[in-house]
């Protein structure tokens, strides 16, 4: 049993960080495998993560951490058994990719302009709290031509457009996804659509 | 928000010990280190020591090494820092503090006067 | 006895800079991060800085820290007499077992 594709890691630069790797044959991650993690600090424990398959000879393991800062480092092991296959570390703040934001709200009773709102994913005392930036993506469930991206670079999770921006009597649908630039992240994954039926009053024409 | 609240001050007689304690509150318990240091009056900060409130271990500044403990309490998210032999130059504010290289949170700190 | 170096005292009127260094060596400052603590008069210290120049929440863009090899440098704009407290360096050790060091402190008087 070898290693094809050695581990690489993710964080949330929260509360998880998620390793993929890959063997060199058909192989079952969760009896076969083990992943063990230690911060390297004074006191810590080592840990194990159980894998799962990630496709026929893919794993994939979710690393739980506590209180995740840019100075930790952490040495992974992977066990086969008694088999050393691979040893390695992991710094979570080089390899950062921000939660999705979530609770993706449209507010369409703010006269003929749309309010899009969602939820910054991190509490207040994580350091991506304040360094979120997010891109914001609108689309027409009927042309798949009508497809937008605004680019939100300030901190409030909100933005507005005019409903008469978008074509009236369809259906929109929208999500959000967020980066950081302090860490050089990767962007998040989208959250969830939400969707809703863009009608607005044309101006009156003399 | 987290909070610690340590214990009251404390007048001690040379060669006896004092236990200080630390409750935490607003956050997972196990999942911060503690740190204890001390001021002595118009002095620095000095380091006294770490607990992993997880399992337990501790590692103590060479200073103190035989004449400090640390404990926690994780039913009651409490940690506690025991001085023994108590002398005149013990007598300093001892405080707690939530983090691990760096400390984010400390307690208001518990006054321990050693005096004949 | 702190092996991190700090002057004992600075000042300088409302409205204007002050830097605080923190001078150590490669077996500490060199090799790891450095934090920042306030103490205003009769409370406990609070964190300012940490990983050597980024701010917690609420610590306001006044307060920047910056790390080059074996110093470290506190800066704070626009002074106000609230700012008037202790000031303490922090990083680790990186002997064994490794410990964290506080700097001796400055005494910061607004004038």
């Known amino acids: 049993m070898k290693v094809l594709q050695e581990p690489t890691c993710v964080s949330d630069y929260m509360s998880i960080s998620t390793c993929e790797w890959k063997m060199n044959g058909p192989t079952n991650c969760s009896t076969e495998l083990r992943l063990l993690y230690q911060l390297v600090f004074l006191l810590s424990e080592a840990h194990t993560c159980i894998p799962e398959n990630n496709g026929g000879a893919g794993c994939v393991c979710h690393l739980l951490m506590d209180d995740v800062v840019s100075a930790d480092n952490y040495t992974l092991d992977l066990w086969a058994g008694q088999q050393l296959l691979w040893k390695g570390s992991f710094k979570p703040s080089e390899h950062v990719k921000p939660r999705a934001p979530g609770n993706l709200t449209v507010h369409t009773n703010v006269s003929d302009t749309l309010l899009l709102t969602w939820s910054n994913p991190y509490p207040p005392d994580n350091y991506l709290y304040n360094h979120l930036t997010y891109a914001v993506n609108i689309w027409s469930e009927n042309d798949p031509a009508d497809f937008r991206i605004y680019n939100v670079t300030y901190l409030e999770p909100s933005l507005r457009i005019a409903a008469s921006t978008l074509k009236s009597g369809i259906s929109y649908r929208a999500r959000v996804r967020a980066w950081a630039q302090c860490y050089n992240t990767t962007w998040s994954e989208w959250s969830p659509s939400t969707k809703w039926h863009n009608s607005y009053r044309e101006p009156f024409e003399q | 928000q987290v909070q610690l609240v340590q214990s009251g001050a404390e007048v001690k007689k040379p060669g006896a010990s004092v236990k200080v304690s630390c409750k935490a509150s607003?956050?997972?318990?196990?999942?911060?280190?503690m740190h204890w240091a001390r001021q002595a009056p118009g002095q620095g900060l000095e380091w006294m020591g770490i607990?992993?409130?997880?399992?337990?271990?501790?590692s103590y500044a060479q200073k103190f090494q035989g004449r400090v403990t640390m404990t926690r309490d994780t039913s009651t998210s409490t940690v506690y820092m025991e001085l023994s032999s108590l002398r005149s130059e013990d007598t300093a504010v001892y405080y707690c503090?939530?983090?691990?290289?760096?400390?984010?949170?400390w307690g208001k700190g518990t006054l321990v006067t050693v005096s004949s | 006895q702190s092996v991190l170096t700090q002057p004992p005292s600075v000042s300088a009127a409302p409205g204007q800079k002050v830097t605080i260094s923190c001078s150590g060596g490669?077996?500490?400052?060199?090799?790891?991060?450095v934090s920042w603590y306030q103490q205003l008069p009769g409370t406990a210290p609070k964190l300012l800085i940490y990983?050597?120049?980024k701010r917690p929440s609420g610590i306001p863009d006044r307060f920047s820290g910056s790390k080059s090899g074996t110093s470290a440098t506190l800066a704070i704009t626009g002074l106000q007499t609230g700012d008037e407290a202790d000031y303490y360096c922090?990083?680790?050790?990186?002997?064994?077992?490794?410990?964290?060091?506080f700097g001796t402190g400055t005494k910061l008087t607004v004038l």
């Open positions: 922090g990083t680790w050790d990186t002997s064994q077992p490794p410990n964290p060091l």
């Open positions: 490669s077996s500490n400052i060199g090799n790891s991060y």
């Open positions: 503090a939530r983090g691990k290289w760096w400390l984010y949170n």
């Open positions: 990983d050597n120049n």
């Open positions: 607003g956050y997972a318990f196990t999942s911060y280190y």
């Open positions: 607990i992993n409130p997880s399992g337990g271990s501790t």
